[in-house]
Amino acid sequence: SQVSQNCHNGSYEISVLMMGNSAFAEPLKNLEDAVNEGLEIVRGRLQNAGLNVTVNATFMYSDGLIHNSGDCRSSTCEGLDLLRKISNAQRMGCVLIGPSCTYSTFQMYLDTELSYPMISAGSFGLSCDYKETLTRLMSPARKLMYFLVNFWKTNDLPFKTYSWSTSYVYKNGTETEDCFWYLNALEASVSYFSHELGFKVVLRQDKEFQDILMDHNRKSNVIIMCGGPEFLYKLKGDRAVAEDIVIILVDLFNDQYFEDNVTAPDYMKNVLVLTLSPGNSLLNSSFSRNLSPTKRDFALAYLNGILLFGHMLKIFLENGENITTPKFAHAFRNLTFEGYDGPVTLDDWGDVDSTMVLLYTSVDTKKYKVLLTYDTHVNKTYPVDMSPTFTWKNSKLPNDITGRGPQ
């Protein structure tokens, strides 16, 4: 049935799906706080622009009885159930914020005639790429893949003089939602990453990973994994590691590396950490006070989703254009808007662009230091530390295949 949108005559509503199954185990109250903080900012911005309109959010909760795994496994049905609820109530906002699970987003996108924009804090998987009315405000797997290929090919930096073409990927099935889809993308045989690499093997058992660390017959010196330092320690412990092993630890949504007085543990010396450039004003904000550094990005994505809607609403209203049109639904891409923590850029497909940061552990101070940054918008690497104090020989990253000469 045709659902009417509460989206005209000076009153604009945002439908926020509050799903029990979520990409991050974040209390829904915190997400509500983020949304409400966003609404306050949007109202202020619209008022400053001389637009006297009402903007509200409706929080749509699922019953939580059937879909109670808490992670994303049963999210497909939960998302569709919520859409059914919207349909039965005959009431939909101008925009849908949520869901965050790849499964539910993919299914909801398939099963609905989307004439309204959908904003997601998550939906990391490749199956959610290139969706015309979907905007993703947390770095999707495609962006990670492009960084890795770019970095693997790089061979003209003082600290990386070899192109790499091989890798192990550690993926044991217990990953968080973001890591699951990041590693899934690297594993997929048809992905850009697999296409560009000559050799790639997925390690699924702890023992496989542990054996590779000192295996003289290993096919690659590079191992990609996803999670925090504690996750690596559980797996690696204090085991000896061959001197030319490089572990790439993908830990995008974790600000802890940038906090004052953080010292890197010994087991991180062979590790390069890939994370996102941290925000600066988040630490003091009211909605983030109760959040762990890992969860700030999730709540921030909800908040920025509200600000993005406010940005688009302002543009359309100033131009005298209708909000309930396909044009509005398709407009949430290829733009930069003022997010909570500074400008946020969305690419041609509505996916957030960001600065990824590769960190290493300095032998001088046992502190994390930035090796390079990568701008996902232009697919370009910018070296920061031209003479890093690495643990690796000659302060250069080793070749990816032991015993192979310069490429």
Epitope: V262, T263, T355, D364, K366, K369, T389
Partner: antibody, heavy 122, light 110 residues
Framework: QVQLQQSGAELARPGASVKLSCKAS????????ITWVKRRTGQGLGWIGE????????YYNEKFKGKATLTADKSSSTAYMELRSLTSEDSAVYFC???????????????WGTGTTVTVSS | DIVLTQSPASLAMSLGKRATISCRAS??????????IHWYQQKPGQPPKLLIH???NLEAGVPARFSGSGSRTDFTLTIDPVEEDDVAIYYC????????FGGGTKLEIK
């Protein structure tokens, strides 16, 4: 509290060498760098170089390569700077300071020694 | 090397007034959203004292009369209100590349 105690004033002949010391206390010596800064009368501050006691790695301003040599003794939490082939241009006050490194790879100097005056005169 | 130009070279202020000292870098000293400029105060016969690190972060124990601002190439140290005890030379330091200090600004009381 964190302190850097520098050695006393030095009077030296042109062509000679001097070795200045900087003893650290009140913090873990190997967790920070020690930087050295020169101040000549009527002139500003000039960065000489830095040493990281944990690794022994040293970093020099090109202008002072060959003039200054930085070393550190972890057991006594003391950093040293040797200045050689002294000329009147080397007459100055030399400060040591604790270097804090941050994740973006920069340094700043939060605690300073009281300075050592070096006078080069025949 | 990055050159830091401080202005004015000297400054005579009345007590209670606002003093502003500028530090301009020959190229950007910002990196990943962090401004790599630090401010020091040096009184006669004393070592320099850290006032502000990373452009705007007040060092512990430094009075709130001191504040810093700016980004990329243009930075400002503000003292408001100026007190007798503030007579000193003020230096900016950049740590984006090989460390360099500005030429200094001498603050005196009228």
């Amino acid at each position: 509290q964190v302190q850097l105690q520098q050695s006393g004033a030095e009077l030296a002949r042109p062509g000679a060498s001097v070795k200045l010391s900087c003893k650290a206390s009140g913090y873990t010596f190997t967790s920070y760098g020690i930087t050295w800064v020169k101040r000549r009368t009527g002139q500003g501050l000039g960065w000489i170089g830095e040493i990281y006691p944990r690794s022994g790695n040293t970093y020099y301003n090109e202008k002072f390569k060959g003039k200054a040599t930085l070393t550190a003794d972890k057991s006594s939490s003391t950093a040293y700077m040797e200045l050689r082939s002294l000329t009147s241009e080397d007459s100055a006050v030399y400060f040591c300071a604790r270097a804090i490194t941050t994740v973006v790879g920069d340094w700043y100097f939060d605690v300073w020694g009281t300075g050592t005056t070096v006078t080069v005169s025949s | 090397d990055i050159v830091l130009t401080q202005s004015p070279a000297s400054l005579a202020m009345s007590l209670g007034k606002r003093a502003t000292i500028s530090c301009r870098a020959s190229e950007s000293v910002s990196l990943i959203g962090t401004n790599l400029i630090h401010w020091y105060q040096q009184k006669p016969g004393q070592p320099p004292k850290l006032l502000i690190h990373h452009a705007s972060n007040l060092e512990a124990g430094v009075p709130a009369r001191f504040s810093g601002s700016g980004s990329r190439t243009d930075f400002t140290l503000t003292i408001d209100p100026v007190e007798e005890d503030d007579v000193a030379i003020y230096y900016c330091l950049q740590s984006r590349k090989i460390r360099t200090f500005g030429g200094g600004t001498k603050l005196e009381i009228k």
